[in-house]
Each structure stands twice: as structure tokens, then as C-alpha cells.
Interface confidence: medium
């Protein structure tokens, strides 16, 4: 076997690994690099290789990976071993697969939903359970209510607010009374002072095909900055989108393709199909990145077990300009591109 | 720089449950196995079971099958070994290690009544 | 299961002696054979792997080698700070197993 045709540094042909064979060395210490790095094709990330010596292209999907060849960790892929474990020595790149997850030291299956208590629903996504309360409470009775109260009733679930004070009149403090709720948080049981905040999201991680975008935002029942990730896909990397350029233009700012198509992830199926819209390309030194975008959730059914959801972004418009570097570079550092905020969540 | 943390030590009574965490940092956590060893004291180390969190799959000892749980948060970059009904001889340092080149600082679990 | 059969026990050596360690594997396991060293308290350091590579970071004195289903650990030159244990592990099969370790220890 060898590795793919990838442009690349690290190519090797490694011998049968039999008994009479030794395992094929595939560092070398001292490093010994190229004077100039590899170029990559679009797509494809040129990051340090194994050995944490030299800049690669990283293996793509399906391809032989080692220590030294290792896998393009921006498309989700990791080493698979399972040929050759635990030797560790030559491996195919495969695409991580939504992990199970473990509460309470029970077991769920990725996408599986289910109701720790009576009081929340949870999914496991990826190794991580998520879950949204089912008890959303409504605001206490009267806005001028000084002192609510949650308070638990007999045979009901969920906590119930009560007023001490139902025979009050409104009072002139219902303007600060009403202010201060919204801080606190009533309906979503949010801490005090808690001050909303979510960054813009990343750049996606691949310049074509699927990727992750994260960002961070405290806006949940804790008022914790957690990391929320959706899927994204910039521009397909099998279409030539320069084909589609008018004639006399140098940029097409949005390709969008012809027919309605499902999306598709680890195996698993979008219940629906989408037409999206896909930043383009320039023929000079410029690039196209998302400036309208949103999030949209997507249901995706599995071939065996349950389905689950994803966010992804949604391309509305894209900008084309000269604020770029080599694409290959953003996956190194995932910095925000300057200028440009997404408008839409 | 590649490094595995684990979580401090443990002191459990027999027959309850431990709970070890390795967090992983320095290189992405879904290409590699992470493999459990332990060691008792004045022993040679003892290979308990891997995991790797990019295919969702793990693999156990034979003589650990059904009382060593591996599990992982790719959120957190973080394995976990949990082992069940402990005896006195499971008093031992645990490691993680990735694939079988760094390992962890280790983590000491005492059983003792 | 692969038995890893490691000689000596123990051996004393002064700084700037060569010491031989040896392990045999009860079956064969190619070159997939791990030796690591463990002061008190530390976890292992992989040494060398597959045999005869050594990691990165680790002293020239330090190589190994194999002949059939017998691989060795050579240290050249000891110095003060190797006095410690060293394991072997072969990596060919599951389970993993270790050799049951060699302390090298000051004359």
C-alpha cells in the first residue's frame, strides 16, 4: 500500500508487515524537511506533521496514515488502527463517528434522546449530553410581585410560582420590578448579573467540503460559556466552480447548484433535501467567505439506530475581497476574518 | 507538547466504583487510543483496556471484562476509566496512555476497608 | 497470551559501564517490541520502539535490537540519571503485555 497521491513530503512505501520484516521507521531524528512546504490542494490542510517536524498535507479520507502521516485533523478524520492495532504502525484515515455517551453511569447511543427526570429532556450528541428543560416556567403572577416563589405541588412535576403578596396593588417599581426579573431570569432560571454574551462563530475549518464552525456563548441556565459547534460546508470540493464564472467577470460570489440534494454525515441521511448556497471563487487573488448567513437545524436519520440533529450554517451571500491569505492558513489558527461579522446567527 | 493529566488520588472501601479522568491535550485527541495500564507497587505494569474516541470503540483485558468501563468527552478531550466492585488487589497506579508513547503522571486508587 | 521473559531482575552498574537487558517473547512478535524506563513515583518513558527506533528526545546510549524472539536493551556509557527500572512491552498482539522488569541499579 502507499499513500495517496496528496502532494507531500512523507510518501513511503512500506513493506508487507510480516514476520520477517521490521516496522517501517517513519521518523527521522534529526527532522529533515523540504526547504519550502508542500502546496496543498483546496481543500486539504497543510499542518505539522506527526513527528512534529515538518509541514504536510494532511491524509484524506481512506488514505494510509502513520505517526509521520497523519490525518487531516480539520475534516474530523483520526488514524484508524483497527487493522493494526496495537501495533500502531500503519493505519486508514476514517471519519470520527458521533460517539455514545455515559450519564448517571448509563449508556446512550449518539442521537439518542431521553428523560433523565421528569424535568428535562437530554440527547446525546458526540460524547456529550445536551439537555433543554421541560419545566419553562411562566413569569411570576403579577410583575410587581415583590417576593415570588418557586414552590413544588404535590403530584405536578414541575415547580409553580406563588405570590406572598397577591393583594398588593401595582406599585410605581413595576417598570424596575419587571427589569429585574429579566435580568434574573425568571422564565429561563437564569443566574443574577448574569450578562448575556456569544461570540461570532469561527470560520469554518475547511476552505471546501464539511467542516466546524464553534463559538462561545453563556446564554444557557448557568450562565456558563460553553462552546456551541455547527456543521459548514464553504463550497463543495468536487465542482470546479471557476467553470461557472461569467463570461468577462473575474468572481462568482455564490454557486448555488441546480438540483435539491440531502445532506449527508457519518452514514447517516437529512430527513429532507436543501438547495444551499455555496460562497465561489475568484480568479484572482481574491476570496469569497459567508457575510449573510444563519443557523439551521438539520434532522438526519441513520441507517441502523436512531437519528439525530445538527446545526448548520446556512449561506445567504458571500463577499468576495482581498483580505485573504493562503487558504491553507486559516486552519492553522482559525482566527476570525477581519472585518466581516456574520449578520444572523 | 503532548500531555496526558489524570485526576489525583482516590481512597474507595471494597466493592465500591473509581473513576479516573486523563485529559489529553497537545495533539488531537480523536487520532490516537488512548490505552489503561496499572501498576501495584513493586510490580511490572499491567494492561487494562483501549479506547479510542475517533471510531467510538474499546477493547478490554480479558481478565477485566465487565468491571473496567472506558468512556470519553471529545468536548473535554478527556478518557475515563471506571472500574467497579474494587478489591483490596486492585490497589495499584493507574496510567492513560496515547497509543504507547506518553503517558499520564498516573493516578493511585486504595482500596482499603 | 504473549509471556515476556526479562533478564536479569536486577543488576549494579557504575557510571560509564554498558548494560545488556533482555527479553524473550514466548511466540513471535516481529519487531513490535517497546522498552521503557520508570524512576520511583514517575510513569514509564518510551525509550525505544519497533525494536530499534529510538524516540525522540531520548539519548544516543540508549539502542536496541533483535535477533529472532530475543530483543535487547543496550545502554552505553550509563550514566547517573539511568539508574532506574526498565520494562519491556510487546505491542504485536492484545493483550499487551510486559516484561516483569529489570532495576539497574549504582554499584
Known amino acids: 500500500t502507499a499513500l495517496s497521491p496528496t502532494p507531500t513530503t512523507m510518501t513511503f512505501t512500506p513493506a508487507p508487515l510480516e514476520e520477517t520484516t521490521t516496522r517501517p521507521e517513519f521518523c527521522k531524528w534529526p527532522c529533515e524537511c523540504p526547504q519550502s512546504p508542500p502546496r496543498c490542494p483546496l481543500g486539504v490542510s497543510l499542518i505539522t506533521d506527526g513527528c512534529e517536524c515538518c509541514k504536510i498535507c494532511a491524509q484524506q479520507l481512506g488514505d494510509n496514515c502513520t505517526e509521520a502521516a497523519i490525518c487531516d485533523p480539520h475534516r474530523g478524520l483520526y488514524c484508524d488502527y483497527s487493522g493494526d492495532r496495537p501495533r500502531y504502525a500503519i493505519g486508514v484515515c476514517a471519519q470520527v463517528v458521533g460517539v455514545g455517551c455515559v450519564l448517571d453511569g448509563v449508556r446512550y447511543t449518539n442521537g439518542e434522546s431521553f428523560q433523565p427526570n421528569c424535568r428535562y429532556n437530554c440527547t446525546c450528541i458526540d460524547g456529550t449530553v445536551g439537555c433543554t428543560p421541560l419545566c419553562l416556567s411562566p413569569r411570576p403572577p403579577r410583575l410587581w410581585c415583590r417576593q415570588p416563589r418557586h414552590v413544588r405541588v404535590p403530584g405536578q412535576c414541575c415547580e409553580q410560582w406563588v405570590c406572598d403578596d397577591d393583594a398588593r396593588r401595582p406599585r410605581q417599581t413595576a417598570l424596575l420590578d419587571t427589569r429585574a426579573f429579566a435580568a434574573s431570569g425568571a422564565v429561563e432560571q437564569r443566574y443574577e448579573n448574569c450578562i448575556a454574551y456569544t461570540s461570532p462563530w469561527s470560520p469554518c475549518s475547511t476552505t471546501c467540503g464539511l467542516g466546524i464552525s464553534t463559538r462561545i456563548s453563556n446564554v444557557n441556565a448557568r450562565c456558563w460559556p460553553e462552546q456551541e459547534s455547527r456543521l459548514c460546508n464553504l463550497r463543495p470540493c468536487d465542482v470546479d466552480i471557476q467553470l461557472h464564472i461569467k463570461a468577462g467577470k473575474k468572481c462568482l460570489a455564490v454557486y448555488q447548484p441546480e438540483e435539491a440534494t440531502n445532506f449527508t454525515l457519518a452514514g447517516c441521511v437529512s430527513t429532507r433535501t436543501y438547495r444551499p448556497k455555496y460562497c465561489g471563487v475568484c480568479t484572482d487573488n481574491r476570496c469569497c467567505i459567508p457575510y449573510k448567513s444563519k443557523t439551521i437545524s438539520v434532522d438526519f436519520q441513520c441507517p441502523e439506530g436512531p437519528g439525530f440533529s445538527r446545526q448548520v450554517l446556512w449561506i445567504n451571500a458571500c463577499f468576495c475581497n482581498l483580505s485573504c491569505r493562503n487558504p491553507n492558513d486559516i486552519f492553522a489558527d482559525l482566527e476570525s476574518y477581519p472585518d466581516f461579522e456574520e449578520i444572523a446567527n | 507538547e503532548v500531555q496526558l493529566v489524570q485526576s489525583g488520588a482516590e481512597v474507595k472501601k471494597p466493592g465500591a466504583s473509581v473513576k479516573v479522568s486523563c485529559k489529553a491535550s497537545g495533539y488531537t485527541f480523536t487520532s490516537y487510543d488512548i490505552n489503561w495500564v496499572r501498576q501495584a507497587t513493586g510490580q511490572g505494569p499491567e494492561w487494562l483496556g483501549w479506547?479510542?474516541?475517533?471510531?467510538?470503540?474499546?477493547g478490554n483485558a480479558q481478565n477485566f471484562q465487565g468491571r473496567v468501563f472506558m468512556t470519553w468527552d471529545t468536548s473535554k478531550d478527556t478518557a475515563y476509566m471506571e472500574m467497579s466492585s474494587l478489591r483490596s488487589d486492585d490497589t495499584a497506579v493507574y496510567y492513560c496512555?496515547?497509543?504507547?508513547?506518553?503517558w499520564g503522571q498516573g493516578t493511585l486508587v486504595t482500596v482499603s476497608s | 497470551d504473549i509471556v515476556m521473559t526479562q533478564t536479569p531482575s536486577s543488576l549494579s552498574a557504575s557510571v560509564g559501564d554498558r548494560v545488556t537487558i533482555t527479553c524473550r517473547a514466548s511466540q513471535s512478535i516481529s519487531s513490535y517490541l517497546n522498552w521503557y524506563q520508570q524512576k520511583p513515583g514517575k510513569a514509564p518513558k518510551l525509550l525505544i520502539y519497533a525494536a530499534s527506533s529510538l524516540q525522540s528526545g531520548v539519548p544516543s546510549r540508549f539502542s536496541g535490537s533483535r535477533s529472532g524472539t530475543d530483543f535487547t536493551l543496550t545502554i552505553t556509557n550509563v550514566q547517573p540519571e539511568d539508574f532506574a527500572t526498565y520494562y519491556c512491552?510487546?505491542?504485536?498482539?492484545?493483550?499487551?503485555?510486559f516484561g516483569q522488569g529489570t532495576k539497574v541499579e549504582i554499584k
Open positions: 479506547l479510542n474516541p475517533g471510531s467510538g470503540k474499546t
Open positions: 512491552l510487546q505491542a504485536y498482539d492484545f493483550p499487551i503485555t
Open positions: 496512555a496515547r497509543n504507547l508513547d506518553y
